[in-house]
């Protein structure tokens, strides 16, 4: 099992959560493993139990405090360890000195709502969740709209290169059902990645007025 390819990846949500995934080919599903976090300049340590998410990967969330509390800063280094039980003792399987603000992945945007809808356009707004005040306005967004007969993968990406928590979708078809998703990414961090996509927001454009050209 030890010789199988293994990987340990963690991201900080910028507030009070470090989410980790541990994968190892050939490891037994019922292996008991945990992630241990040891910050270099904090008095707390934190542990979470890795739970299986697929045949060869496990995940857990290190909850560092209240969801909106700022538990780490740009100068913190957190030593992370994967520990797996082997008989009566714990064995270290992976180690990393983790710089939280170099490894960011924010929570998905929330509270998506239709502000105004017409026949050909729709104005949508959203909010960011549990994002650090350190970012100020240094965030970007990607959005996509699901049209009838298409898949999310086929939807063109709309890029918002600033902290803009709304969008006006145009050139839509009247009386048509659409879905909309958005995701967010801080500009900071060498290994920072996009948040998960938000929950889809379903909306329908207004029908064209009778007797008028569309």
């Amino acid at each position: 099992a030890v010789n199988g390819t293994s990987q340990f990846t963690c991201f900080y949500n910028s507030r009070a959560n470090i989410s980790c995934v541990w994968s190892q080919d050939g490891a037994l599903q019922d292996t008991s493993c945990q992630v241990h976090a040891w910050p270099d300049r904090r008095r707390w340590n934190q542990t979470c139990e890795l739970l299986p998410v697929s045949q060869a990967s496990w995940a857990c969330n290190l909850i560092l405090g209240a969801p909106d509390s700022q538990k780490l800063t740009t100068v913190d280094i957190v030593t992370l360890r994967v520990l797996c039980r082997e008989g009566v003792r714990w064995r270290v399987m992976a180690i990393q000195d983790f710089k939280p603000f170099e490894n960011l992945r924010l929570m998905a945007p929330i509270s998506l709502q239709v502000v105004h809808v017409e026949t050909h356009r729709c104005n949508i707004s959203w909010e960011i969740s549990q994002a650090s005040h350190y970012f100020e306005r240094h965030l970007e967004f990607e959005a996509r709209t699901l049209s009838p007969g298409h898949t999310w993968e086929e939807a063109p990406l709309l890029t918002l290169k600033q902290k803009q928590e709304w969008i006006c979708l145009e050139t839509l078809t009247p009386d048509t059902q659409y879905e909309f998703q958005v995701r967010v990414k801080p500009l900071q961090g060498e290994f920072t990645t996009w948040s998960p996509w938000s929950q889809p927001l379903a909306f329908r454009t207004k029908p064209a007025a009778l007797g008028k050209d569309t």
Epitope: V2, N3, T5, D40, T79, A94, I95, Q96, D97, E190
Partner: nanobody, 125 residues
């Protein structure tokens, strides 16, 4: 790019000690997790020890725990493996490895991007 050059290998009697050194060149060394692996004749390359870039985290193969110590000196771009109470079964070529940039040190070879050429350690009984 990280270039790695090992030194310090040699012939030693069982129960003796050796200190292996790994000299690294490359700007990212000071924020890269490092490891040592070894390959005995006719066997697969196996994990020996690893260390995080600050030196706060270490891990060892069960077979060397308590006998070997991994350390590093970032100011000199060096990683060391102090090997005490050597046994004939420690005979192997020892390789220094640099983990993938920004990634954890793991026990599998696939987690490492850069490798040295190796240094021979022979333990006679």
């Amino acid at each position: 790019q990280v270039q790695l050059v090992e030194s310090g290998g040699g012939l030693v009697q069982a129960g003796g000690s050796l200190r292996l050194s790994c000299a690294a060149s490359g700007r990212t060394f000071s924020t890269t997790e490092m490891g040592w692996f070894r390959q005995a004749p006719g066997k697969e390359r196996e994990f020996v020890a690893a260390i995080t870039w600050t030196g706060r985290g270490t891990m060892y193969a069960e077979s060397v725990e308590g006998r070997f110590t991994i350390s590093r000196e970032n100011a000199k771009n060096m990683v060391y493996l102090q090997m005490n109470s050597l046994k004939p079964e420690d005979t192997a070529i020892y390789y220094c490895a640099a983990a993938r940039r920004g990634r954890a040190a793991v026990r599998s070879e696939g987690g490492y991007d850069f490798w040295g050429q190796g240094t021979q350690v022979t333990v006679s009984s």
